[in-house]
């Protein structure tokens, strides 16, 4: 799997999409997990509804939400109020039994808000009471890592 880069602006919402073959993954629940190190496990962040026929319902865990268009074959993850600590490597997964297939490897990059001059009065941050439906979703910038780019750069 190539890694697809999604860039979002700090404080805004980032939408990550993972297309898949709807017939191949028919009946399978999906998940979004965070990769812990190059060879480490992928830690589950949020998964779709327990009942596959209700996968289109938005499920959330903290500031992360997931919804699955099972007929169209697109898994969508929304990271709300993006923060620097959200940057890192993730996976979209298709679950079957205790196994998980990787649908897409994702690198989330968090860009500094160009309008942020550290004047909190000018900065809009979604409040806790605001729903995902109300949150502004920034159109994400995405690209695949070029051949030769190292997804996990060696640590010094």
């Amino acid at each position: 799997h190539n890694t697809t880069v999604f860039q979002g602006v700090e404080g805004q919402s980032l939408q990550v999409s993972c297309p898949y073959d709807s017939m191949k993954h028919w009946g399978r629940r999906k998940a979004w997990c965070r990769q812990l190190g190059e060879k480490g496990p992928c830690q589950r962040v949020v998964s779709t509804h327990n009942l596959w026929l209700l996968s289109f319902l938005r499920r959330r865990n903290g500031s992360t939400a997931i919804t699955d268009d099972t007929l169209g074959g697109t898994l969508t993850i929304t990271l709300r109020n993006l923060q620097p600590h959200d940057a890192g490597f993730y996976q979209c997964q298709s679950l079957h039994g205790s196994e998980a297939d990787t649908l897409r490897k994702v690198l989330v990059e968090v860009l500094a808000d160009p309008l942020d001059h550290r004047d909190a009065g000018d900065l809009w941050v979604p409040g806790e009471s605001e729903s995902f439906e109300d949150a502004h979703v920034e159109h994400s910038i995405s690209r695949s890592l070029l051949e030769g780019e190292i997804p996990f750069p060696p640590t010094s």
Epitope: N50, L53, F56, R59, L71
Partner: antibody
Framework: EVQLVESGGGLVQPGRSLRLSCTAS????????MSWFRQAPGKGLEWVGF??????????EYTASVKGRFTISRDGSKSIAYLQMNSLKTEDTAVYYC?????????????????WGQGTMVTVSS | DIQMTQSPSSLSASVGDRVTITCQAS??????LNWYQQKPGKAPKLLIY???NLETGVPSRFSGSGSGTDFTFTISSLQPEDIATYYC????????FGGGTKVEIK
């Protein structure tokens, strides 16, 4: 008139089988998810399972207590949903209702059930 | 699994009274909650979906509110035809009903 009519209930011995039918009329049957619920005498409502609309090709979901014993199916040409109940237990005794899942504006359905049948009684006893 | 706790289990009120029923989920279910009315010997009837949306054709004296774990169903002015048992139903995890609230007229 939009209507659902259940049939097939009755008295059955433990371990035996029974098939319930839910005949729909007044709406485009294939466009809707269909569900079965039950209510034991003097008790509350319990979801049994449901089957997706035609677009979902007969995909089903069940509550844990009936999984492997009950099967939901649908016949689009007859506008009938079925509940096949095998290996029946005394605790399956209940009034069984079929119901239609509400449709959402943007094409998906909603797990709120806006049309219900009158119910059919199933008694499992030796 | 989520537990749905409805209270009270029964109540008696006069015609014209405001009646309130609560439903508490054992964990956050956002607004994934419906309310049904079931009259004796009859099938359930959908009244409220998504916690607060009134089903088409349902009288406006019925309303629902809440999100997260705590939900409220209200009959603003109780009518004789409202004698029934009322159930909440979550759909965040599976499809689980509350135990029901039986409403009677004093």
């Amino acid at each position: 008139e939009v209507q659902l009519v259940e049939s097939g209930g009755g008295l059955v011995q433990p371990g035996r089988s029974l098939r319930l039918s839910c005949t729909a009329s007044g709406f485009t049957f294939g466009d809707y998810a269909m569900s079965w619920f039950r209510q034991a005498p003097g008790k509350g409502l319990e979801w049994v399972g449901f089957i997706g609309s035609k677009a979902y090709g007969g995909t089903t979901e069940y509550t844990a207590s009936v999984k492997g014993r009950f099967t939901i199916s649908r016949d689009g040409s007859k506008s009938i949903a079925y509940l096949q109940m095998n290996s029946l237990k005394t605790e399956d005794t209940a009034v069984y209702y079929c119901a239609r899942g509400k449709r959402r504006d943007y094409g998906y359905w909603h797990p709120a059930f806006d049309v219900w049948g009158q119910g059919t009684m199933v008694t499992v006893s030796s | 699994d989520i537990q749905m706790t409805q209270s009270p289990s029964s109540l008696s009120a006069s015609v014209g009274d405001r009646v309130t029923i609560t439903c508490q989920a054992s964990q956050d279910i956002t607004n994934y909650l419906n309310w049904y009315q079931q009259k004796p010997g009859k099938a359930p009837k959908l009244l409220i979906y998504d916690a607060s949306n009134l089903e088409t054709g349902v009288p406006s004296r019925f309303s629902g509110s809440g999100s997260g774990t705590d939900f409220t169903f209200t009959i603003s002015s109780l009518q004789p035809e409202d004698i029934a048992t009322y159930y909440c139903q979550e759909y965040d995890q599976y499809l689980t009903f509350g135990g029901g609230t039986k409403v009677e007229i004093k």
